[in-house]
């Protein structure tokens, strides 16, 4: 498994990571940590593992956290209710 660096699918990344779009270069995907408490997220980011190619630069939130709306169009990883 690729622990950091370029990837195409989640299966190439280590535990606690997903293969997300690079913030810097949209055409590249890199192994990215799953969302921690307080991290920005998107509510429809695919679960891990996802067998297709992700379009977002964020990973799903870590287990026990949920991607919740805090204001219009702003979502953050927060403890599940």
């Amino acid at each position: 498994a690729v622990i950091t660096g370029a990837c195409d699918k989640d299966s190439q990344c280590g535990g606690g990571m997903c293969c997300a779009v690079s913030i810097w270069v949209k055409s590249i995907r890199i192994c990215t940590p799953m969302g921690k408490l307080g991290d920005s997220c998107h509510p429809l980011t695919r679960k891990v593992p996802f067998f297709g190619r992700r379009m977002h630069h964020t990973c799903p939130c870590l287990p026990g956290l949920a991607c919740l709306r805090t204001s219009f169009n702003r979502f953050i990883c927060l403890a599940q209710k």
């Epitope: 998107h42 509510p43 679960k47 067998f51 297709g52 379009m55 977002h56 630069h57 169009n73």
Partner: antibody
């Protein structure tokens, strides 16, 4: 060839439950999510929810929460939709549809033939 | 929920002419520069068929007379040269926010 074959038409009484099956073939079942969509007679399309066929994680339209259950049986490559507390407004054709794995752009690329569920006293 | 409104409700176009269907979302369906909008075609007695995903991407096997455009809240499906087999109902669908919602449909007929 990808195929989604659904169970046959059902007639149910108000208050009853119905379970519709969708048997997939021609692809790796656990690599794709499965959506369920319904269409009332002469009406438009309404999304019910979807399931990860890999780990069973579900996302439901809140409108149906508490009445709908989507499950999968990986051993038979079959997805199921169960709808309870049926009412006349639930009369519709119910479709399963495979998600195409286009990243976060959820899109339904293959559809079952549809199952007509009629709710009538 | 995001409300999708299509216009017109029905459309009659001559064979070989251009058909244009509009879809307006009650709020933006964009995220990080991508537009989360799909278009489907449904013929009588058949399930829907995916034509366009993520606003402008042509699904494999779909004729290139179909195209999608738009961003934010306003989207368009264009059939550049209408063929007899294009007679159908067309639906837009937003997939940026759950629940995924469809427009009410636009019926396309031959004039």
């Amino acid at each position: 060839e990808v195929q989604l074959v659904q169970s046959g038409a059902e007639v149910k009484k108000p208050g009853a439950s119905v379970k519709v099956s969708c048997k997939a073939s021609g692809y790796s079942f656990t690599d794709y999510d499965m959506h369920w969509v319904r269409q009332a007679p002469g009406q438009g399309l309404e999304w019910i929810g979807y399931i990860s066929c890999y780990n069973g994680a579900t996302t439901y339209n809140q409108k149906f929460k508490g009445r709908v259950t989507i499950t999968v049986d990986k051993s038979t490559s079959t997805a199921y939709l169960e709808l309870s507390s049926l009412r006349s407004e639930d009369t519709a054709v119910y479709y399963c549809a495979r998600d195409g794995n286009y990243g976060e752009a959820y899109a339904m690329d293959y559809w079952g033939q549809g199952t007509l569920v009629t709710v009538s006293s | 929920d995001i409300v999708m409104t299509q216009s017109p409700d029905s459309l009659a176009v001559s064979l070989g002419e251009r058909a244009t269907i509009n879809c307006k979302a009650s709020q933006s369906v964009d995220y990080e520069g991508d537009s989360y909008m799909n278009w489907y075609q449904q013929k009588p007695g058949q399930p829907p068929k995916l034509l366009i995903y993520a606003a402008s991407n042509l699904e494999s096997g779909v004729p290139d007379r179909f195209s999608g455009s738009g961003s934010g809240t306003d989207f368009t499906l264009t059939i550049s040269s209408l063929q007899a087999e294009d007679v159908a109902v067309y639906y837009c669908q937003q997939i940026n926010e759950d629940p995924f919602t469809f427009g009410q449909g636009t019926k396309v007929e031959i004039k």
